[in-house]
């Protein structure tokens, strides 16, 4: 079998909401995969699951099934959501987020994101993580890649 | 409905001291930043001090940095404005107002209070 | 600082008739993010400031539509479709671009 590539494109788009009683915030993070197949046969992505981590919190996890099937030499970029919080027990990140005097909200977030597919009864799983900025402070469409924090991607000098 | 009444308002000698209260109602005060707002006989309005919900953030202009301090707290809904080395020039109304972050603006306003400053 | 000029004065109005405010920032208070950070308050007499417009074309929460607000980076209006006498009072704008956070000197509206 040749391979199975998954590749992590970006933050599509963050919607964000706020409780002002609970002091959270409610960020609905919506990914983009492209997920090639190399084989001459169809393959089933059976499941993506995908966890979203701010300094090392877990702050959200999204599992979805029986997504697509992927047809020979074929490549479908699936969109995902990650409906994330963070909450009272990161204070002051609320505080950052609803901030009136800073106009662009970035945080750093660990995306992390496995897709499961299977051919011929054999499953295989494919694992990407990738640091992403996201705006905490309002509603962001982003463009492809546009999101991507480089700094940590980088190797260390 | 939202409510934001200031008090401690009064006439004070140059260089003298005095503090500023604003109690809210009406909505969660712990959830969001305040600003102080002044007013002066002129009838011009100038930002004098913001402070974040929870305490992280604060904020003031040049023009009173080191002579008013913001403070709030949320168990008593109470924004406070310490005010010291008072100047003539600091004769004004102060209206504390509240911060709607999806606005991105204060929306309501107390009615504010008045110090004059003269000797 | 970013300065905010306004005149002081409308031209007078008759009730009924439409009014512009105009308001004029030193430096562009249109963000990369595509907001333009510019405000509208009203002072009624005897009263405290309300808001009227958030970021420059978005009316607050129970202000009549018969106003609107619109703008480039630098230069505003503020318009009044058809003017009532509860309009009254001093027009405010504003901008939190930047700290510290500026505001106009106001312009009275004049009713004829």
């Known amino acids: 079998p040749r391979s199975i590539e998954v590749k992590y494109i970006g933050v599509k788009s963050a919607y964000v909401s706020y409780d002002a009683e609970k002091r959270t915030i409610y960020l609905n993070i919506t990914n983009t995969l492209n997920i090639t197949n190399n084989n001459y046969y169809s393959v089933e992505v059976e499941n993506i699951t995908a966890q979203v981590q701010f300094s090392k919190t877990v702050i959200g996890k999204a599992r979805l099934n029986n997504i697509t099937n992927i047809g020979p030499l074929d490549m479908k970029q699936i969109d995902y959501t990650v409906p994330t919080v963070i909450a009272e027990e990161m204070s002051y990140m609320y505080d950052f987020c609803t901030l009136l005097s800073i106009k662009v909200h970035n945080i750093v977030l660990m995306m992390q994101v496995t897709v499961t597919t299977a051919y011929f009864g054999h499953s295989e799983q494919i694992s990407q993580e990738r640091y992403q900025y996201v705006d905490c402070g309002r509603n962001t469409t982003y463009q492809l890649a546009q999101s991507e924090y480089l700094n940590v991607l980088q190797p260390q000098q | 409905e939202v409510q934001l009444v200031e008090s401690g308002g009064d006439l004070v000698k140059p260089g003298g001291s005095l503090k500023l209260s604003c109690v809210a109602s009406?909505?969660?005060?712990?959830?969001?930043?305040m600003s102080w707002v002044r007013q002066t006989p002129d009838k011009r309005l100038e930002w004098v001090a913001t402070?974040?919900?929870?305490?992280?953030?604060?904020y003031y202009p040049d023009s009173v940095k080191g002579r008013l301090t913001v403070s709030r707290d949320n168990a008593k809904n109470t924004l406070y404005l310490q005010m010291s080395s008072l100047k003539s020039e600091d004769t004004a109304i102060y209206y504390c107002?509240?911060?709607?972050?999806?606005?991105?603006?204060?929306?309501?306003w107390g009615q504010g209070t008045t110090l004059t400053v003269s000797s | 600082d970013i300065v905010m000029t306004q005149a002081a004065f409308s031209n007078p109005v008759t009730l009924g008739t439409s009014a512009s405010i105009s308001c004029r920032s030193s430096?562009?208070?249109?963000?990369?993010?595509?907001?333009?950070?510019l405000y509208w308050y009203l002072q009624k007499p005897g009263q405290s400031p309300q808001l009227l417009i958030y970021?420059?074309?978005n009316l607050a929460s129970g202000v009549p539509n018969r106003f609107s607000s619109s703008g480039s980076g630098t230069d505003f209006t503020l318009r009044i479709s058809r003017v009532e006498a509860e309009d009254v009072g001093v027009y405010y704008c504003?901008?939190?671009?930047?700290?510290?956070?500026?505001f106009g000197g106001g312009t009275k509206l004049e009713i004829k």
């Open positions: 430096k562009s208070l249109l963000h990369s993010n595509g907001i333009t950070y």
């Open positions: 107002a509240r911060q709607n972050f999806y606005y991105g603006c204060e929306d309501y």
């Open positions: 504003a901008q939190n671009l930047e700290l510290p956070w500026t």
């Open positions: 009406g909505f969660t005060f712990s959830g969001y930043g």
């Open positions: 970021q420059m074309s």
């Open positions: 402070i974040s919900s929870g305490s992280f953030y604060i």
